[in-house]
Amino acid sequence: FVRTKIDTTENLLNTEVHSSPAQRWSMQVPPEVSAEAGDAAVLPCTFTHPHRHYDGPLTAIWRAGEPYAGPQVFRCAAARGSELCQTALSLHGRFRLLGNPRRNDLSLRVERLALADDRRYFCRVEFAGDVHDRYESRHGVRLHVTAAPRIVNISVLPSPAHAFRALCTAEGEPPPALAWSGPALGNSLAAVRSPREGHGHLVTAELPALTHDGRYTCTAANSLGRSEASVYLFRFHGASGAST
């Protein structure tokens, strides 16, 4: 795979021999679009090109993560003279073209947003008729997905010397602040771990030593809301039982 910005054939320069329109290849995308998880977002992308009145076959492509090499999340193709761009790929069926590529608009709608959609997206157009030419946005649009906190895991685990520790993992954007409360604890921020590499929206808080039986509650909060979950510690006959 050659990481090229544009692949061209030799005949593309003759399109301007007799006229010199001011347009050249360019793409316009905003730096960032924000939306809440569960909602839909529109990723705007418009372009200009030097091939006047191009009416041949074209393909519109969106990719995620990185330009030129990132995985495609959407692709559609329009036949010569057609304004209908037939979808060939829509990852999980959630991506839909809003714009009309014939009118230099590749804007994309993303449905049912999840935190995993928080990435940079790059639009690309390919001409494949008398003219072979293509162009891809180099800087892309960052889709910033926000979400109220959700506790994805809460558990009690054995520690050395017959002790127990509790772990609470939550997701959200902005990353939520976690606090533990429980017997003889009051409220404690309890060793919050930074978001992990590749899991930027996950935050974990550990309660290193559970000294009393009872209910331990983890609360996750950010500017969009709060969530809580509890575990119960009962020690009997030297063993432990934990339930949520």
């Epitope: 910005k5 320069l13 050249r24 030097p50 180099r138």
Partner: antibody, heavy 116, light 109 residues
Framework: QLQLQESGPGLVKPSETLSLTCAVS???????WSWVRQPPGKGLEWIGE???????TYKPSLKSRVTISVDNSKNQLSLKLTSVTAADTAVYYC???????????WGRGTMVTVSS | SSELTQDPAVSVALGQTVRITCRGD??????ASWYQQKPRQAPQLVIY???NRASGIPDRFSGSISGNTASLTITGAQAEDEAAYFC???????????FGGGTKVTVLG
């Protein structure tokens, strides 16, 4: 504000490898970055570029000798040019591409002389 | 050709208008950017894309493009505009960047 600072040895022997780094401060490294060089008294020559995701493109005539990489954790990029000759003597600049093919921020440049 | 060609030198009287050109087949497809470089300094972006002035650039600088030629015009040249000016764009394949050879602008008077 965003600043770029190139660093590396000012003198490299012929046939050896030229290694330079560019420290990015005052902003995220999330962008496209290029290395450009300028031989004494001459014009600018684009060497290649790297995206913060690791994607690279190089000038074809230099491609066999050049490697550009990015270290997101250190907020820096690097240039390696192998098998250097006197023709590689130049001021080497790193620059940020803020819009397609347009560089708005440049480092001050570092002079590299290839000589035995 | 993937080259961008500039005239090596041009002079202009103080307060007058000067036009610097950059020629190349790739300019039929891609916009050019323009940079000013003073002695012992790094280049500074002046104009990018169709005719966008970079931050802090006076409005006496403007850009245009027609056919295979991009132009940088300085209307009412000042003494501080004396510098080398370089254009850049993609090559005809679009796969990599090229710079013009540069034009040395001398402001007289």
């Amino acid at each position: 504000q965003l600043q770029l600072q190139e660093s590396g040895p000012g003198l490299v022997k012929p046939s050896e490898t030229l290694s330079l780094t560019c420290a990015v401060s005052g902003a995220s490294i999330s962008n496209w970055w290029s290395w450009v060089r300028q031989p004494p008294g001459k014009g600018l020559e684009w060497i290649g570029e790297v995206h913060h995701s690791g994607v690279t493109t190089y000038k074809p005539s230099l491609k066999s000798r050049v490697t550009i990489s990015v270290d997101n954790s250190k907020n820096q990029l690097s240039l390696k040019l192998t098998s250097v000759t006197a023709a590689d003597t130049a001021v080497y600049y790193c620059a940020r591409e803020f819009a397609d093919d347009a560089f708005d921020i440049w480092g001050r440049g570092t002079m590299v002389t290839v000589s035995s | 050709s993937s080259e961008l060609t500039q005239d090596p030198a041009v002079s202009v009287a103080l307060g007058q208008t000067v036009r610097i050109t950059c020629r190349g087949d790739s300019l039929r497809k891609y916009y050019a950017s323009w940079y000013q470089q003073k002695p012992r300094q790094a280049p500074q972006l002046v104009i990018y894309h169709k005719n966008n002035r970079a931050s802090g650039i006076p409005d006496r600088f403007s850009g245009s493009i027609s056919g295979n030629t991009a132009s940088l015009t300085i209307t009412g040249a000042q003494a501080e505009d004396e510098a080398a000016y370089f254009c850049n764009s993609r090559d005809t394949s679009g796969n990599y960047l090229v710079f013009g050879g540069g034009t040395k602008v001398t402001v007289l008077g």
